[in-house]
């Protein structure tokens, strides 16, 4: 599972008086010579880039996705990759690069013009010309040419949750991403079984907010698993 | 002008807790990894703990862990560090900063102070036996 994969994660040798070790969502950190990594006693020196192990996009780097290292990997196991530049494959935006967007499977420019007329156009063609709304958000968005100077406000159209203001993230609604509002305590959030099953909503909901997680609510433990109700709850 | 004020500080007896509080002004910090670093007397700054921009990814020193929690509210621009069983070697002057969200991640990444571009001017923890 991902969880073991980074317990056993450990950073043996940061120049002193810092060290680190890969955790999720928690790590211990400790000052001592070399990098030991699981499957194998071999250690390596703090120059070679570190795999970041993420549970998604936003936990990497701008330049990052995150993702199973190998093809048709084991799906719990996801680390931060380098992003796909232009003309190369990709499956959803944040594959692709700052500056691009992934259109038909291809990292594509996203220059301002052209990104707001095929989000738009996207959109459009997938609802018809029905502008009615469905959970408070509106089905046809178009990406404001402000949204590289400021950040997205609630329902903007957004790559990364960068892109959006404090207290939203982005999350896929429909076939497009938006800005949302992140999870306050007692709303209801989504506890994915599996790493990378996120991957399947098309209403993707938020992260719970500061000092919540996502648990399952006390008078649903005797619900079945699959009806099991989870909200957001002070840690 | 980018400021991080800290706060909490105090002095407290072996086994008790503090809350540490960073404030952030002049500018968001939503993208930026938060952390806190400490110093004691005559010896060199170390790293304490840090918190990711997505909220949802900390890192700790061996000697902290499951002693230190460290969050974050993006809304209020501020980061927080709850230390409890608190101990003798835990007195330091203890800083607060922000590293900018990187293009490529790792943990290294956390706990190197050179990726710090904003710092407080420290708050101080005294913890006696």
């Known amino acids: 599972t991902l969880n073991s994969v980074l317990n056993s994660n450990a950073i043996k040798n940061l120049p002193p008086p810092l060290g680190g070790a890969a955790g999720h969502p928690g790590s211990a950190v400790s000052a001592a010579p070399g990098i030991l990594y699981p499957g194998g006693n071999k250690y390596q020196t703090i120059d070679n880039y570190q795999p970041y192990p993420c549970a998604e996009d936003e936990e990497c780097g701008t330049d990052e996705y995150c993702a199973s290292p190998t093809r048709g990997g084991d799906a719990g196991v996801q680390i931060c990759l380098a992003c796909r530049k232009r003309r190369k494959r990709c499956m959803r935006h944040a594959m692709c690069c700052p500056g691009n967007y992934c259109k038909n499977g291809i990292c594509v420019s996203s220059d301002q013009n052209h990104f707001r007329g095929e989000i738009e156009e996207t959109i459009t063609e997938s609802f018809g010309n029905d502008h009615s709304t469905l959970d408070g958000y509106s089905r046809r968005t178009t990406l404001s040419s402000k949204m590289y100077h400021t950040k997205g406000q609630e329902g903007s159209v957004c790559l990364r949750s960068s892109d959006c203001a404090s207290g939203l993230c982005c999350a896929r609604h429909f076939w497009s991403k938006i800005c949302k509002p992140v999870l306050k305590e007692g709303q209801v959030c989504t506890k994915h079984r599996r790493k990378g099953s996120h991957g399947l909503e098309i209403f993707q909901r938020c992260y719970c907010g500061e000092g919540l997680s996502c648990r399952i609510q006390k008078d649903h433990h005797q619900a079945s698993n699959s009806s099991r109700l989870h909200t957001c709850q002070r840690h | 002008e980018v400021q991080l004020v800290e706060s909490g500080g105090g002095s407290v007896q072996a086994g008790g807790s503090l809350r540490l509080s960073c404030t952030a002004s002049?500018?968001?910090?939503?993208?930026?990894?938060m952390a806190w670093f400490r110093q004691a007397p005559g010896k060199e700054r170390e790293f304490v703990a840090a918190?990711?921009?997505?909220?949802?990814?900390?890192h700790y020193a061996n000697s902290v862990e499951g002693r230190f929690t460290i969050s974050r509210d993006n809304a209020k621009n501020t980061a927080f560090m709850q230390m409890s069983s608190l101990k003798p070697e835990d007195t330091a002057v203890y800083y607060c900063?922000?590293?900018?969200?990187?293009?490529?991640?790792?943990?290294?990444?956390?706990?190197?102070?050179?990726?710090?571009?904003?710092w407080g001017q420290g708050t101080q923890v005294t913890v006696s036996s």
């Open positions: 918190i990711s921009w997505s909220l949802s990814r900390t």
């Open positions: 002049g500018r968001p910090f939503d993208n930026y990894a």
């Open positions: 900063a922000a590293a900018p969200r990187p293009k490529r991640v790792s943990v290294q990444y956390f706990v190197t102070s050179s990726n710090y571009d904003y």
